[in-house]
């Protein structure tokens, strides 16, 4: 009976340790509002354990509920800059496959120079997340000011 | 064969339940920008399970990737106060050992009176996290307005 | 001896996968500052796995430490609107049972149109969380702008 109980345990690999924290690589060409991300120990404190990068966008490898979080700071910014260039908006969404395209998280800068938020959302293997920064202001590439990550939470 | 499968399970203690949520104790003397934290059930809803406090700074006890989060609200503040006293900046970083010193998370208040953010970052046993509030404005000690915490996420 | 080791493993059901992500349903009548939430796959990307809704408020079903997060965006808002209607404040707290009533998380909008934050807090089975929006401005019901969730983290 104790032996049967052990079978209800959770195998290590099914714990879904999938997690990623990315730093900004670059912005896209004009007409492309996407931010392009990079990650890996050679770059500092960013990493990918499970998810992968596909041309700078984050692709999910395991179905489940994820905590998605982001912080974006504008590079040359004061409250007057931010309000004069309003609206500057950051949206995180599933951008492919097209059939699952949806905005998950959206924030405007108004008179601030940083946005930060997080949410729980179901994601499926193959979902690619895009982060769109609309407006004319550029994001800071400092790794403590601009970052984007996901953490698998449960099946 | 079923018995061998049980051996791939994850022992409870290796799940790394390390977690802490702290409330503001006090600010440092002038020329010391650090916030000093405290935690424990006698103080309300703050706690330390694994990490420890070392002279008001949070010390990590288990290697791993952590979710670090913080919210700081300024005590006497309006949007005009915040902009007049700009820059008021909050930075969370590893402050010791000196060889691992780095800024992990940085936000400015601009015309706002609260900053809140979170990020995933690798931390090692012995890392001490410091939270530096630069500028002349003082943080609120209300436990629902100012808090700082970490949560172990994976090895 | 290997068999005894297996008994220290963590059963799947005790991992406490309790998690919920809610979208705004409606605001209360005048004199009732509470936001009323809804969740479920039929509504989009919101869900309840463990916690339940009780008249639009979130009720906890499992003791433990939870990560509570929220984002609220005001519906018709600019930085001038927000400052003219100041103070507009969002508070998340335990509202029942009355003996455990406490504010967990509080933010003011000042000149911004979105607040977002998160914190770790102990919650007990039967705790009901309320989110109070005080002021005259109304929240957006867009699911990527206003959401509220909890995630069980540890016992």
């Amino acid at each position: 009976q104790r032996f049967a109980q052990a079978q209800q345990q959770l195998p290590l690999e099914s714990l879904g340790w999938d997690v990623a924290e990315l730093q900004l690589n670059h912005t896209g060409p004009q007409q492309d509002p996407r931010l392009y991300w990079q990650g890996g120990p050679a770059l500092g404190r960013s990493f990918l354990h499970g998810p992968e990068l596909d041309k700078g966008q984050l692709r999910i490898h395991r179905d489940g509920i994820y905590m998605v979080h982001i912080q974006v700071t504008l590079a040359i910014c004061s409250s007057t800059t931010a309000s004069r260039h309003h609206p500057t908006t950051l949206a995180v969404g599933i951008c492919s496959p097209a059939s699952r395209s949806i905005s998950l998280l959206r924030l405007s800068f108004h008179q601030g120079c940083t946005i930060a938020s997080q949410r729980l959302t179901p994601l499926a293997r193959g979902d690619t997340l895009c982060t769109n920064l609309t407006g004319t202001l550029l994001p800071s590439r400092n790794t403590d000011e601009t970052f984007f990550g996901v953490q698998w939470v449960r099946p | 064969q079923r018995f061998a499968q049980a051996q791939q399970q994850l022992p409870l203690e290796s799940l790394g339940w390390d977690v802490a949520e702290l409330q503001l104790n006090h600010t440092g003397p002038q020329q010391d920008p650090r916030l000093y934290w405290q935690g424990g059930p006698a103080l309300g809803r703050s706690f330390l399970h694994g990490p420890e406090l070392d002279k008001g700074q949070l010390r990590i006890h288990r290697d791993g990737i952590y979710m670090v989060h913080i919210q700081v609200t300024l005590a006497i503040c309006s949007s005009t106060t915040a902009s007049r006293h700009h820059p008021t900046t909050l930075a969370v970083g590893i402050c010791s050992p000196a060889s691992r010193s780095i800024s992990l998370l940085r936000l400015s208040f601009h015309q706002g009176c609260t900053i809140a953010s979170q990020r995933l970052t690798p931390l090692a046993r012995g890392d001490t996290l410091c939270t530096n509030l630069t500028g002349t404005l003082l943080p609120s000690r209300n436990t629902d307005e100012t808090f700082f915490g970490v949560q172990w996420v994976r090895p | 001896q290997r068999f005894a080791q297996a008994q220290q493993q963590l059963p799947l059901e005790s991992l406490g996968w309790d998690v919920a992500e809610l979208q705004l349903n409606h605001t209360g009548p005048q004199q009732d500052p509470r936001l009323y939430w809804q969740g479920g796959p039929a509504l989009g990307r919101s869900f309840l796995h463990g916690p339940e809704l009780d008249k639009g408020q979130l009720r906890i079903h499992r003791d433990g430490i939870y990560m509570v997060h929220i984002q609220v965006t005001l519906a018709i808002c600019s930085s001038t609107t927000a400052s003219r209607h100041h103070p507009t404040t969002l508070a998340v707290g335990i509202c029942s049972p009355a003996s455990r009533s406490i504010s967990l998380l509080r933010l003011s909008f000042h000149q911004g149109c979105t607040i977002a934050s998160q914190r770790l807090t102990p919650l007990a089975r039967g705790d009901t969380l309320c989110t109070n929006l005080t002021g005259t401005l109304l929240p957006s019901r867009n699911t990527d702008e206003t959401f509220f969730g909890v995630q069980w983290v540890r016992p």
Epitope: - | H26, T27, P29, Q30, D32, T136 | -
Partner: nanobody, 116 residues
Framework: QVQLQESGGGLVQTGGSLRLSCTAS????????GSWYRQAPGNQRELVAI???????NYADSVAGRFTISRDSAWKALYLQMNSLKPEDTAVYFC??????????WGQGTQVTVSS
């Protein structure tokens, strides 16, 4: 048990000055912050000035440059020097001391009336 008692309030003309004092009796220890609040009729209590154990001070926009908060070294007294008083400064003024352990000690309040 700690008790706080304010004094120094009264009636003063616009442009005048007052010095409020707040004396602490009882076993006072581990104080990390002292504050002055005020409450005008029909308004919420407003935080006016703060001083920390480290000596840092902050003031509300409405009083900055006119009011000065200070304390004695043992937290036995807290002071608020109010200069260039205006009719809108009329309120009941309360002193507050906060301990490390989040105990909040309050005085009963002293009335300040500024006539034009």
């Amino acid at each position: 048990q700690v008790q706080l008692q304010e004094s120094g309030g009264g009636l003063v003309q616009t442009g005048g000055s007052l010095r409020l004092s707040c004396t602490a009796s009882g076993s006072i220890f581990d104080i990390v912050r002292g504050s002055w609040y005020r409450q005008a009729p029909g308004n919420q209590r407003e935080l006016v000035a703060i001083i920390t154990s480290g000596g840092a001070t902050n003031y509300a926009d409405s009083v900055a440059g006119r009011f000065t908060i200070s304390r004695d070294s043992a937290w036995k007294a807290l002071y608020l020097q109010m200069n260039s008083l205006k009719p809108e400064d009329t309120a009941v003024y309360f002193c507050n001391m906060e301990s490390v352990r989040y105990r909040n000690y309050w005085g009963q309040g002293t009335q300040v009336t500024v006539s034009s």
